[in-house]
């Protein structure tokens, strides 16, 4: 069979080889398409409800005024010339539709290095067959599931037209110290060959490099955290980040019910104040970061240096 590719909505003429150019003609067309069950016979003297889809022209050719998805299939003509010689024509018709130019929607203007980011969603509407969408970075194809690249795809079919809408959502994890203005684009490749790809306009998000978090420092006075009964301990939480984060305090792994403050004063230390203290700095952009833990202990008279371990207590400190 001869392969014919026709664009949806366009007319198509299939020649009946060996048919006399003018009536009377002895010929018949048989079609097996999405509009038929098994074979439908059309003859030159036909004329009827099928004319809107396919009709035999005076020269014996079959005319399809506007090819549709349902016209995909096999078309055969059997003709006899004036001398009684029989000729057969056999066509395999496939149809296609080129979509509009694909677009990137919901595109990000800024990406964060080192973490997964949604770059955008590429949308192509009105294709047949479905075809495929692919992403490019600086003109080179992006391979899903490689180097922090992931793609989520969706294909929908219009209930009336039968045409496809494709969606492809791109997620990337930009490398730290990489290109600060990468160029992303998306292209649609048709399901039928011989048609070139359609590419979107490129997008160029900025890549934001988060400043590496410096350690949260916890300073204890007196040094070592050992104090005589009734003495005072001052804990200071130092965070170099700007703007200053909120500081909360923990004792023995439990948050202390105190308002945020970078300094915690424990006056008139008693046994209930002994324990392990740490501070937690909460940044708006990074989440919580905890300091090292320090042990606060009471030196009984005659003892030197901090006692090992701690006794759990419920006393609360004072905030400076």
């Amino acid at each position: 069979a001869q392969n014919i590719t026709a664009r949806i909505g366009e007319p198509l003429v299939l020649k009946c080889k060996g048919a006399p150019k003018k009536p009377p003609q002895r010929l018949e067309w048989k079609l097996n398409t999405g509009r038929t069950e098994a074979w439908k016979v059309l003859s030159p003297q036909g004329g009827g409800p099928w004319d809107s889809v396919a009709r035999v022209l005076p020269n014996g050719s079959l005319f399809l005024p506007a090819v549709g998805i349902q016209d995909e299939g096999i078309f055969r003509c059997q003709a006899m010339n004036r001398n009684g010689k029989e000729t057969k024509s056999n066509y395999r018709v496939r149809v296609y539709q080129i979509p509009g130019k694909p677009e990137i929607v919901d595109s990000a203007s800024e990406l964060t290095a080192g973490v997964p980011n949604k770059v955008g969603t590429c949308v192509s509407e009105g294709s047949y067959p479905a075809g495929t969408l692919s992403w490019h970075l600086d003109g080179k194809p992006l391979v899903p599931n490689e180097k922090g690249v992931s793609v989520k795809e969706q294909t929908r079919r219009h209930p009336e037209t039968g045409l496809f809408t494709l969606q492809s959502e791109l997620m990337v994890t930009p490398a730290r110290g990489g290109d600060p203005r990468p160029t992303f684009s998306c292209s649609f490749s048709p399901g039928l060959p011989r048609h070139r790809a359609l590419r979107t306009a490129p997008i160029q998000p900025r890549v934001w490099e988060p400043v590496p978090l410096e350690e949260v420092q916890l300073v204890v006075e007196p040094e070592g955290g050992a104090v005589a009964p009734g003495g005072t301990v001052t804990l200071t939480c130092e965070v170099p980040a700007q703007p200053s984060p909120q500081i909360h305090w923990m004792k023995d792994g439990v948050p202390l019910p105190l308002p945020p403050s970078p300094v915690l004063i424990l006056p008139e230390i008693g046994p209930q104040d002994q324990g392990t203290y740490s501070c937690v700095a909460t940044h708006s952009s990074h989440g919580p970061q905890e300091s090292r833990a320090v042990s606060i202990s009471i030196i009984e008279p005659g003892e030197e240096g901090p006692t090992a371990g701690s006794v759990g207590g419920s006393g609360l400190g004072t905030l400076a």
Epitope: T36, E37, K40, G47, P49, W50, D51, S52, V53
Partner: antibody, heavy 119, light 107 residues
Framework: EVQLVESGGGLVQPGGSLRLSCAAS????????MTWVRQAPGKGLEWVAS????????YYPDSVKDRFTISRDNAKNSLYLQMNSLRAEDTAVYYC????????????WGQGTLVTVSS | DIQMTQSPSSLSASVGDRVTITCRAS??????VNWFQQKPGKAPRRLIY???NLADGVPSRFSGSRSGTDFTLTISSLQPEDFATYYC?????????FGGGTKVEIK
């Protein structure tokens, strides 16, 4: 909303003529074949004529061929049926319907107009 | 010409009954059959197209089926508003032909 409104029916003597009209709205008229169907009093439905979307091709059953002519004016969204040499057996309610080819059959109908052929 | 032989020509049924109406084509018409409902003094209303497809706005109790050249309209549970006359139509070839109609009456 698709609407088809017939007009032009009435009483006519045998051998006389009548022209029916159908005003279409609510859809792209020139995308569809159009058809006239009739129904004699107390009887079933009978196909009368069809026309393709361009108006280039018309189709009739033998019972009305050479007497009836279907036409359309796509600029006016209107369908017509010119009926000549009318007979008593042409007495019926005449309906205008959208479609008539294999893509739809008939999907929408007008309310009908009565044609009475009698002396 | 293709004849569409519709049966029965009339039937009596009660609300809730399952009703089946058949049309037999005298030759192959493929899937190109409509079913219509008509109430007295009103225009026909399409129920089924291409033998088995339910038209927009038609209740799901109506269904169409095909076996070769036999076409069936089924009403799974007859409702009071379903008492009417039903017609089939073949639109595969000219002349387009309707079945003779089936009048569904209250028992």
């Amino acid at each position: 909303e698709v609407q088809l409104v017939e007009s032009g029916g009435g009483l006519v003597q045998p051998g006389g003529s009548l022209r029916l009209s159908c005003a279409a709205s609510g859809f792209t008229f020139n995308n569809y074949w159009m058809t006239w169907v009739r129904q004699a009093p107390g009887k079933g439905l009978e196909w009368v004529a069809s026309i393709d979307n361009s108006g280039d091709n018309t189709y009739y059953p033998d019972s009305v061929k050479d007497r009836f002519t279907i036409s359309r004016d796509n600029a006016k969204n209107s369908l017509y049926l010119q009926m000549n040499s009318l007979r008593a057996e042409d007495t019926a309610v005449y309906y205008c319907a959208r479609g008539g080819d294999i893509t739809t059959g008939f999907d929408y109908w007008g309310q009908g107009t009565l044609v009475t052929v009698s002396s | 010409d293709i004849q569409m032989t519709q049966s029965p020509s009339s039937l009596s049924a009660s609300v809730g009954d399952r009703v089946t109406i058949t049309c037999r084509a005298s030759q192959d018409v493929g899937i190109y059959v409509n079913w219509f409902q008509q109430k007295p003094g009103k225009a026909p209303r399409r129920l089924i197209y291409r033998a088995t497809n339910l038209a927009d706005g038609v209740p799901s109790r109506f269904s169409g089926s095909r076996s070769g050249t036999d076409f069936t309209l089924t009403i799974s549970s007859l409702q009071p508003e379903d008492f009417a006359t039903y017609y089939c139509l073949q639109y595969d070839a000219h002349p387009l032909t309707f079945g003779g109609g089936t009048k569904v009456e209250i028992k």
